[in-house]
Interface confidence: medium
């Protein structure tokens, strides 16, 4: 019996050659499929093409990356995989929303309001404060600065708000 599998041209790339008595067969490796549509074939008439596993393998809120003969899933930013692996292939894994506001109260800085959203969060300021125009949530340096009244030139005697204004301690009323 001749071992046809000894010939490197007996089967295409990404295929396994199986020698039988007086014959041989080619089978595509896992993650690849035959261009002929047949499970077994001979020679280079068919090729083994990468199966795009990314059509349905990854859970919601994740990105699928197809690799030769395989794939992996990665959760979107703001989501974490339920098995703790950054790149995963397990079918049962979910990408769950992270509550950034609970994880770290300093996410938005002092005098701020952090609001969790699906896959993200947003920062705002409590009454009497407004966002610092030089900071940005995207860069992680969001901050809130006190809103000061513009002082009137005519000082009203015994007016508490005017006095606070001159001392730089007055804040804009919440209403």
């Amino acid at each position: 019996d001749v071992d046809e599998c000894a010939d490197p041209r007996a089967c295409p790339e990404h295929a396994t050659c199986n020698n039988t008595v007086g014959n041989y067969s080619c089978f595509c490796n896992p993650g690849f499929e035959s261009s002929s549509g047949h499970l077994s074939f001979q020679g280079l008439k068919a090729s083994c093409e990468d199966i795009d596993e990314c059509t349905e393998m990854c859970p919601i809120n994740s990105t699928c990356t197809n690799t030769p003969g395989s794939y992996f899933c990665t959760c979107h930013p703001g989501f974490a995989p339920s098995n703790g692996q950054l790149n995963f292939t397990d079918q049962g894994v979910e990408c769950r929303d992270i509550d950034e506001c609970r994880q770290d109260p300093s996410t938005c800085g002092p005098n701020s309001i952090c609001t969790n959203a699906l896959g993200s969060y947003s920062c705002g300021c409590i009454a009497g404060f407004h966002p610092n125009p030089e900071g940005s949530q995207k860069d992680g340096n969001f901050s809130c600065q006190r809103v000061l009244f513009k002082c009137k030139e005519d000082v009203i005697p015994d007016n508490k708000q005017i006095q606070q204004c001159q001392e730089g301690t007055a804040v804009k009323p919440a209403y």
Epitope: A80, G84, Q85, R96, D97, I98, D99, C101, R102, Q103, D104, P105, S106, S112, I113, C114, T115, N116, I126, G140
Partner: antibody, heavy 116, light 112 residues
């Protein structure tokens, strides 16, 4: 897999200092804060403190003067240091993380005995 | 500091009973972001605690639907509709809204 593992001295003499290490895997300390919780024998849970992802810390008011938490992001390790130990510091010490929601990831705990 | 008071400290039950545990905070635990970070944990002997409920009423992944949480402001309740043997242990409420963070003293759920 998200894992946290504490390692400590086991036995410490009164008035001495304590250092416990928490080694984490499955996530990065640059993205997640680590909390410390302890439980004296037969008693309840007590929150000790936290080091947030950005490196900021908060501590239990009653223990603040004796506690310090630090970390090494590159080694995936968090350190709990406590000085002037007394017998009532005998407890199981846990490191804990908030992976999604609440304290959903706990270490198995390390037992500390303060005794002469 | 926010103090968390649990009642009762011990709760004897028969399997299949409904159980209810109360948790009261010394001040409002509504976070500045509007969320109330009140959580419930179960600790069984020789094990680390396990998260059951987060943000007052949300069951954590894998927690049976016989567990439910409710409440607002300063008063919170954990209910177990039909107690099973695996539910026995010590239940802790916890507030994660204001540092320093604090646990309740715990409620031991045990068989009559």
């Amino acid at each position: 897999q998200v894992q946290l593992k504490e390692s400590g001295p086991g036995l410490v003499a009164p008035s001495q200092s304590l250092s416990i290490t928490c080694t984490v895997s499955g996530f990065s300390l640059t993205n997640f804060g680590i909390h410390w919780v302890r439980q004296p024998p037969g008693k309840g849970l007590e929150w000790l403190g936290v080091i947030w992802s950005g490196g900021g810390t908060n501590y239990n008011s009653a223990l603040m003067s004796r506690l310090s938490i630090s970390k090494d992001n590159s080694k995936s390790q968090v350190f709990l240091k406590m000085n002037s130990l007394q017998t009532d510091d005998t407890a199981i010490y846990y490191c804990v993380s908030i992976y999604y929601r609440g304290f959903d990831s706990w270490g198995q705990g390390t037992t500390l005995t303060v005794s002469s | 500091d926010v103090f968390m008071t649990q009642a009762p400290l011990s709760l004897p039950v028969s399997l299949g009973d409904q159980a209810s545990i109360s948790c009261r905070s010394s001040q409002s635990i509504v976070h500045s972001n509007g969320n109330t970070y009140l959580e419930w944990y179960l600790q069984k002997p020789g094990q680390s605690p396990k998260l059951l409920i987060y943000r007052v009423s949300n069951r954590f992944s894998g927690v049976p639907d016989r567990f439910s949480g409710s409440g607002s402001g300063t008063d919170f309740t954990l209910k177990i509709s039909r107690v099973e043997a695996e539910d026995l242990g010590v239940y802790y409420c916890f507030q994660g809204s204001h540092v320093p963070l604090t646990f309740g003293a715990g409620t031991r759920l045990e068989l009559k």
